[in-house]
């Protein structure tokens, strides 16, 4: 089955700048600003566009060693990014893949809203574990806030 979870979160960082840092340079930035959450990001194949496969490794003590993400779409004009978790982590006997969509929308106050959709593709009639969804959401929030804190302090970066 397919289970869809949608969330929204806000940032004080303008949409274009956040897209550049959080989406386009996340591979480089995440291990630097959130070493407690991401150990490394390695490009397995591709140049960042659709079809690119990345291996994200987690620090010791995490329940999972790594995940592999596949980039599905990068829309620089509308600040949209689609990717799928295709291997490692929770992917296995009961879960086929997780398709994720992130859209960053500018807000009148100069900040932005992140609209996030996570589709869990389970095998057969398996359900999605609530703690899996919660952990994924928390990881996303951790990375966003880590990037936001760095960008607030470095106004010259990612302009």
């Amino acid at each position: 089955g397919v289970f869809n979870y949608e969330t929204e979160t806000t940032s004080v960082i303008p949409a274009a700048r956040l897209f550049k840092a959080f989406i386009l340079d996340g591979d480089n930035l995440f291990p630097k600003v959130a070493p407690q959450a991401i150990s490394s990001v390695e490009n397995i194949e591709g140049n960042g566009g659709p079809g690119t496969i990345k291996k994200i490794s987690f620090p010791e003590g995490f329940p999972f060693k790594y995940v592999k993400d596949r980039v599905d779409e990068v829309d620089h004009t509308n600040f949209k990014y689609n990717y799928s978790v295709i291997e490692g982590g929770p992917i296995g006997d009961t879960l086929e893949k997780i398709s994720n969509e992130i859209k960053i929308v500018a807000t009148p106050d100069g900040g932005s809203i992140l609209k996030i959709s996570n589709k869990y593709h389970t095998k057969g009639d398996h359900e999605v574990k609530a703690e899996q969804v919660k952990a994924s959401k928390e990881m996303g929030e951790t990375l966003l806030r880590a990037v936001e804190s760095y960008l607030l302090a470095h106004s010259d970066a990612y302009n």
Epitope: V12, K32, A153
Partner: antibody
Framework: EVQLVQSGAEVKKPGESLNISCNGS????????IAWVRQMPGKGLEWMGI????????KYRPSFQGQVTISADKSITTAYLQWSRLKVSDTAIYYC????????????WGQGTLVTVSS | DIQMTQSPSSLSASVGDRVTITCQAS??????LNWYQQKPGKAPKLLIY???SLQSGVPSRFSGSGSGTDFTLTISSLQPEDFATYYC??????FGEGTKVEIT
């Protein structure tokens, strides 16, 4: 045990060059930013800049840009703060610190290096 | 650059007193604020990170609160070893001017 050990006190003349060091141990040195912080005599703490030893990405506070150079050698887990021409106003204690807490809090600090510049 | 303004610059208090130090950012820094304690001749020590999270090993009498532009460090019951200078700091950036806590 995480430790940052700084080089010893220095007495220099104006116009001279200087390199002070900060050696990190007990953790993966390449994975955490190192910050340099200045404290002039009787004054507060001033953020100078940071370096990420993994790829030597460096960010300076605008007022210190061009005044000092921050570098690192990950092969010997050491960060450096360098001056090409010292001024009397560079007299201060310089601390290095590891940014290991969530959102870049400085969780471990070196003992400080006193730099005295006098003619 | 975002400016950090700390107040008061100094205060006198007695053992057992409740002490409050404030820090104001010139624009919103969300909750990306750290508090440090420094004793004479020593390196600073991290007390609070992310505005309200207590650093490991720091006594629970220290607490932090606030978000956006206004932040507070509270010492619920001042102990003899707490007489020191306290600094707020925007993560990855500037420190406040410091608050010296002295014995009355």
């Amino acid at each position: 045990e995480v430790q940052l050990v700084q080089s010893g006190a220095e007495v220099k003349k104006p116009g001279e060059s200087l390199n002070i060091s900060c050696n990190g141990s007990g953790y993966n040195f390449t994975k955490y930013w190192i910050a340099w912080v200045r404290q002039m005599p009787g004054k507060g703490l001033e953020w100078m800049g940071i370096i990420y030893p993994g790829d030597s990405d460096t960010k300076y506070r605008p007022s210190f840009q061009g005044q000092v150079t921050i570098s690192a050698d990950k092969s010997i887990t050491t960060a450096y703060l360098q001056w090409s021409r010292l001024k009397v106003s560079d007299t201060a204690i310089y601390y290095c610190a590891r940014l290991g807490a969530t959102y870049g809090g400085a969780d471990y600090w070196g003992q400080g290096t006193l730099v005295t510049v006098s003619s | 650059d975002i400016q950090m303004t700390q107040s008061p610059s100094s205060l006198s208090a007695s053992v057992g007193d409740r002490v409050t130090i404030t820090c104001q950012a010139s624009q919103s820094i969300v909750n990306y604020l750290n508090w440090y304690q420094q004793k004479p001749g020593k390196a600073p020590k991290l007390l609070i990170y992310a505005a309200s999270s207590l650093q490991s090993g720091v006594p629970s009498r220290f607490s932090g609160s606030g978000s956006g532009t206004d932040f507070t460090l509270t010492i619920s019951s001042l102990q003899p070893e707490d007489f020191a200078t306290y600094y707020c700091q925007q993560s990855y950036a500037a420190f406040g001017e410091g608050t010296k806590v002295e014995i009355t």
